[in-house]
């Protein structure tokens, strides 16, 4: 039985489509292609005589159609008006003609989408972020990608407005990364340039790492004290030190050479992040013994945080 196959079935505007004829009869002498579901002289696109290999355009010919000896019809630079049915009539030597109808659907060429955001530098646990994929295109599917992966399942992620809008509720530091949106129809897809979400967070409660030179398990008089403070923060926190409440340097590491019992006291590391408006600190008590029996760092470190 004569059949028509459209390749592809869903065509993007401006592309081309090939209507392929299958199971052509042996005694064929010519073909005629018509726009629509029936044979109608006003809808004739093109006729073809096999013996002379002559193609004759009809009233529905647009100049974009090409007929081939195997009865296939190529339509180039398709428009949405080309959507619909196409009928092939095969003229046989016994004058008992055969007909078959095929169809294809033309979808608009999709624009490259872009992402707008209400806040590309949100503060953790404080701000929500809404990404909007633009423009709005009818009969189009909207998809979102985070760091090249499909959206994770999370109660803090909400899709709305036909998936055009992605909202991150109470943003977390792990939400940072590259966001893309993609628009799809059955014929094509187009993806936006990535937008980077920079989540501001911290500073977390700092930690102090005691490094003693030479390495030892206790603080002996004459040793070098090397206190390193660290706090997770974006942007990096500003560090500062206080010894017994007296401001010291603004470095991450506090170094004191050849400590003595005069260096006993409370050592506080302060961290601040102007972008989040948050501060934190940790206090450690240090005891230095003049003899070989040193208690070292106090076991109980205090930490304070302020918002």
């Amino acid at each position: 039985k004569l059949t028509i196959e459209s390749t592809p079935f869903n065509v993007a505007e401006g592309k081309e489509v090939l209507l392929l004829a299958h199971n052509l009869p042996q005694n064929r002498i010519g073909y005629s292609w018509y726009k629509g579901e029936r044979v109608d002289g006003n809808s004739l696109i093109v006729g073809y005589v096999i013996g002379t290999q002559q193609a004759t355009p009809g009233p529905a010919y647009s100049g974009r159609e090409t007929i081939y000896p195997n009865a296939s019809l190529l339509i180039q630079n398709v428009t949405q008006n080309d959507t619909g049915f196409y009928t092939l009539q095969v003229i046989k030597s016994d004058l008992v003609n055969e007909e078959a109808t095929g169809q294809f659907h033309v979808y608009p060429e999709l624009p490259k989408p872009s992402i707008s955001s209400n806040n590309s530098n949100p503060v953790e646990d404080k701000d929500a972020v809404a990404f909007t994929c633009e423009p709005e295109v009818q009969n189009t599917t909207y998809l979102w990608w985070v760091n090249g992966q499909s959206l994770p399942v999370s109660p803090r992620l909400q899709l709305s407005n036909g998936n055009m809008t992605l909202t991150l509720l109470s943003v977390k530091r792990n939400d940072a990364g590259s966001y893309e949106c993609e628009i799809q129809n059955p014929a094509s897809a187009n993806r936006s340039d990535p937008v980077t979400l920079n989540v501001l967070y911290g500073p977390d409660v700092p930690t102090i790492s005691p490094i003693i030179s030479p390495p030892d398990s206790s603080y002996l008089s004459g040793a070098n004290l090397n206190l390193s403070c660290h706090s997770a923060s974006n942007p990096s926190p500003q560090y500062s030190w206080r010894i017994n409440g007296i401001p010291q340097q603004h470095t991450q590491v506090l170094f004191i050479a050849k400590i003595t019992p005069n260096n006993n006291g409370t050592y506080a590391c302060f961290v601040s992040n102007l972008a989040t408006g948050r501060n934190n600190s940790i206090v450690k008590s240090i005891t230095v013994s003049a003899s070989g029996t040193s208690p070292g760092l106090s076991a109980g470190a205090h930490h304070h945080h302020h918002h």
Partner: antibody, heavy 120, light 107 residues
Framework: QVQLVQSGAEVKKPGASVKVSCKAS????????LHWVRQAPGQGLEWIGY????????SYAQKFQGRVTMTRDTSTSTVYMELSSLRSEDTAVYYC?????????????WGQGTLVTVSS | DIQMTQSPSSLSASVGDRVTITCRAS??????LAWYQQKPGKVPKLLIY???NLVEGVPSRFSGSGSGTDFTLTISSLQPEDVATYYC?????????FGQGTKVEIK
Amino acid sequence: QVQLVQSGAEVKKPGASVKVSCKASGYIFTSYWLHWVRQAPGQGLEWIGYINPNTGYTSYAQKFQGRVTMTRDTSTSTVYMELSSLRSEDTAVYYCAREYGNYNYPLDYWGQGTLVTVSS
Amino acid sequence: DIQMTQSPSSLSASVGDRVTITCRASENQYGYLAWYQQKPGKVPKLLIYNTKNLVEGVPSRFSGSGSGTDFTLTISSLQPEDVATYYCQHHLGTPYTFGQGTKVEIK
């Protein structure tokens, strides 16, 4: 007290290289990052880049990428800034400056400056 | 890169006048902004950091304010020794960028 002492003035031909030194004293050299800033005659301040003397890590302004190299010698508490492929518009006073603290701080102590003149 | 725009480029005021210099950043700086003073033939001197923190030894007639992208340096009562060029600079990560400078003169 904190001091940053730079090497003396240099006159160079276009296409040549210049290496300026900055010797630090009065503080723990490896604890503070050192930046280089230049100032063309009658002009404003332009940041070139910085080096972390502890690790040797460097970061340069895009404009100077490929032409500038910053190094350090912890044994002498000295940092160096070498600028290659000199052109006349590189004529400027080059300053080394210490960052006030670690991470997101400005520059609190500055060297006296080194005048580099590029002329044929 | 972040652009820093200062205004005015120069000003002339009388001793005792209140002087204001503004600095605008092309992006939010979250308060990471510093001011420097450079007297003729001298090296730059840090006056203020974190928008409003006065460096030890800097006279209290200098003050800073602002947030986001707009910042101000104020000299409450201009003194002859304040004749200099003043630069703003953001210090939220590198590359650091400076304003083009404001030259302050005495009438």
